[in-house]
């Protein structure tokens, strides 16, 4: 697992300072108050489908 300040967590995960490791954003459904869930909200796990102009 990455240390903070190096490469970001993989897609679908976010860094937890509390646990000192990358954590699954999917777990925020069960534990929405986890520290890393804020990072999940800011970076959706799947790319957006671009709308036609």
């Amino acid at each position: 697992e990455q240390a903070p300040g190096t490469a970001p967590c993989s897609r679908g995960s976010s860094w937890s300072a509390d646990l000192d490791k990358c954590m699954d954003c999917a777990s925020c459904r069960a534990r929405p108050h986890s520290d890393f869930c804020l990072g999940c909200a800011a970076a959706p796990p799947a790319p957006f489908r671009l709308l036609w102009p």
Partner: antibody, heavy 119, light 111 residues
Framework: QVQLQQSGGGLVQPGGSMKLSCIAS????????MSWVRQSPEKGLEWVAE??????????HYAESVKGKFTISRDDSKSRFFLQMNNLRAEDTGIYYC??????????WGQGTDLTVSS | DIVMTQTPASLAVSLGQRATISCRAS??????????MHWYQQKPGQPPKLLIK???SLESGVPARFSGSGSGTDFTLNIHPVEEDDTATYYC?????????FGGGTKLEIK
């Protein structure tokens, strides 16, 4: 290195009691939810009970088949948790595993301990 | 309770070929973003070992020969190419709600 070390188990008569213990090391125990999962040839893998973390008010959940019979508890200061089993019956026979989960999947597992309920 | 139905119950696959194991949940275990389905491998005398989480996310340290797919009620575990060491029983598990339930297992034999 993560370890879940189990103790307890053995042979107990129907109607009897048994307490299983699990000591954790190598991860932030207090942040994790802890479960007991049992396995038997008849029922396969069966989730039994869960105790959540302090931030979740140590909420407990049980399989319907063990409600009122089993009690799960934890001691964060010593990184250990327990399963107190009362009024045991033959259908409670199996291998009992302790396991940790942050949420959703069972990440780390103990080595398993055998419980036999028989006269 | 959500019932997990795994097929087949047993499977024999030649070395180097593909093994496909299916798991069907009695109701959807997916949101628009994630599927709450997980796969484990168990060898005799050992506890289960996590392989795949959230339907398709490979657990750290698990070989890329293992892959998972599916959403809603239907999920698949693929192993390709299979190796001798893959002889084991494989289980699916949902975490959509309590009680968490497991499939009945698929015993994989390598020919």
């Amino acid at each position: 290195q993560v370890q879940l070390q189990q103790s307890g188990g053995g042979l107990v008569q129907p109607g009897g009691s048994m307490k299983l213990s699990c000591i954790a090391s190598g991860f932030t125990f207090s942040s994790y939810w802890m479960s007991w999962v049992r396995q038997s040839p008849e029922k396969g893998l069966e989730w039994v009970a869960e105790i959540r973390s302090k931030s979740d008010n140590y909420a407990t959940h049980y399989a319907e088949s063990v409600k009122g019979k089993f009690t799960i508890s934890r001691d964060d200061s010593k990184s250990r948790f327990f399963l107190q089993m009362n009024n045991l019956r033959a259908e409670d026979t199996g291998i009992y595993y302790c396991s940790s989960t942050y949420a959703d999947y069972f990440h780390y597992w103990g080595q398993g301990t055998d419980l036999t309920v028989s006269s | 309770d959500i019932v997990m139905t795994q097929t087949p119950a047993s499977l024999a696959v030649s070395l180097g070929q593909r093994a496909t194991i299916s798991c069907r949940a009695s109701q959807s275990v997916s949101t628009s973003t994630y599927s709450y389905m997980h796969w484990y491998q168990q060898k005799p005398g050992q506890p289960p070992k996590l392989l795949i989480k959230y339907a398709s996310s490979l657990e750290s340290g698990v070989p890329a020969r293992f892959s998972g797919s599916g959403s809603g009620t239907d999920f698949t575990l693929n192993i390709h190419p299979v190796e001798e060491d893959d002889t084991a029983t494989y289980y699916c598990q949902h975490s959509w709600e309590i009680p968490y339930t497991f499939g009945g297992g698929t015993k994989l034999e390598i020919k």
